[in-house]
């Protein structure tokens, strides 16, 4: 038998259980927490990854100013409800019957309410701004080299189509990556920008979701690019609905 047959694992998601019980002894993998079958040739949805994480044992180069409607994920981890395709359900509730509406990346976009709260549709996050600060280096990175390497990273590692990386901005030491993907642009089989951003965020934190014990090795012209701070802003196709009380808090 071949070495590949020995290695029944999921390259794109280490939070899976895999066995060679697919057709013709093919390797088949299911996500922890949900038990859903996953396609290991592409990224697993953020919803299924969060569910798996919660089930695991506890252990011009001007910078963009996020719009007034940009959301930041301040709520952190929760055990989400995912639909049969692995996407976030529009309404999420916790064990104490507190409910809220989320966008396609699972970030809360309304005030919290009770079980009577209605979330009519899953609102798409169509613009993600990833704001990074890199560790000090001997000199600034060359902007075009940095731009090319980050675009290549998203294409090769996260399998994100290049057209969805809208821009890479750089003013040392701040790097901003803009991802844009409207509902009409996303074809079947395209990686979602929300999933790519989540994998990138986990990589930057040293918590790679890819198979094995390794992590992200990102270099620009051989010089390691090490990030010391990350902020991610999410912009939805429909602005979020928060009460004024929250906005003035």
């Amino acid at each position: 038998h071949t070495a590949a047959q020995d290695n029944c694992t999921c390259p794109t998601n280490k939070m899976t259980v895999c066995s060679p019980d697919g057709p013709g002894g093919r390797c088949q993998c299911r996500a922890l927490g949900s038990g859903m079958a996953v396609d290991c040739s592409t990224l697993t949805s953020k919803c299924l990854l969060l569910k798996a994480r919660m089930s695991a044992p506890k252990n011009a180069r001007t910078l963009v100013r996020p719009s007034e409607h940009a959301l930041v994920d301040n709520d952190g981890l929760y055990d989400p409800d995912c639909d049969p395709e692995g996407r976030f359900k529009a309404r999420q509730c916790n064990q104490t019957s507190v409910c809220w509406c989320v966008n396609s990346v699972g970030v809360r976009r309304t005030d919290k309410g009770d079980l009577s709260l209605r979330c009519d549709e899953l609102v798409r996050t169509h613009h993600i701004l990833i704001d990074l600060r890199h560790r000090p280096t001997a000199g600034a990175f060359n902007h075009s080299d940095l731009d090319a390497e980050l675009r290549r990273l998203f294409r090769e590692r996260y399998r994100l189509h290049p057209k969805f990386v809208a821009a890479v901005h750089y003013e040392q030491p701040t790097i901003q990556i803009e991802l844009r993907q409207n509902t009409s642009q996303k074809a079947a089989g395209d990686v979602d920008i929300g999933d790519a951003a989540y994998y990138f965020e986990r990589d930057i934190k040293g918590e790679s979701l890819f198979q094995g014990r390794g992590g992200l090795d990102l270099r620009v012209r051989g010089e390691p690019l090490q990030v010391e701070r990350t902020l991610i802003y999410y912009l939805d196709e429909i602005p979020p609905k928060f009460s004024m009380k929250r906005l003035t808090a």
């Epitope: 694992t9 090769e156 590692r157 390794g214 992590g215």
Partner: nanobody, 125 residues
Framework: EVQLLESGGGLVQPGGSLRLSCVDS????????MGWFRRAPGKGLEGVSV????????YYADSVKDRFTISRDNAKNTVYLQMNSLKPEDTAMYYC??????????????????WGQGTLVTVSS
């Protein structure tokens, strides 16, 4: 679809040399850690050597240190394993492996996602 194709195996006498090659047909080659693994008859898979994308880091199993040398040519999408002072215990099927792009890797097979079909190396007099 990444395809790794090994070549260079064969029959060699103890003390002799062989050079294995592995061509990666994928476009992501230059950002992958590449490795060589082997399986001796009746044994499990053993990590032999690994090289980083830029060739600046290499790892070797204790059993092959100072005898085997791994190298890569990113212009040719090829990784090599130069094997000198070969011993009968080096007899095995040798496999080339590639990590997921931009993913660090060690001599652990779990760190690798793509595999070749193997090339047989026989060391015998």
């Amino acid at each position: 679809e990444v395809q790794l194709l090994e070549s260079g195996g064969g029959l060699v006498q103890p003390g002799g040399s062989l050079r294995l090659s592995c061509v990666d047909s994928g476009s992501t080659y230059s950002r992958r850690y590449m490795g060589w693994f082997r399986r001796a008859p009746g044994k499990g898979l053993e990590g032999v050597s690994v090289i980083s994308p830029y060739g600046d880091s290499t790892y070797y199993a204790d059993s092959v240190k100072d005898r085997f040398t791994i190298s890569r040519d990113n212009a040719k999408n090829t990784v090599y394993l130069q094997m000198n002072s070969l011993k009968p215990e080096d007899t095995a099927m040798y496999y080339c492996a590639a990590s997921w792009p931009y993913q660090t890797a060690s001599l652990d097979a779990m760190d690798f996602t793509d595999w070749g079909q193997g090339t047989l190396v026989t060391v015998s007099s």
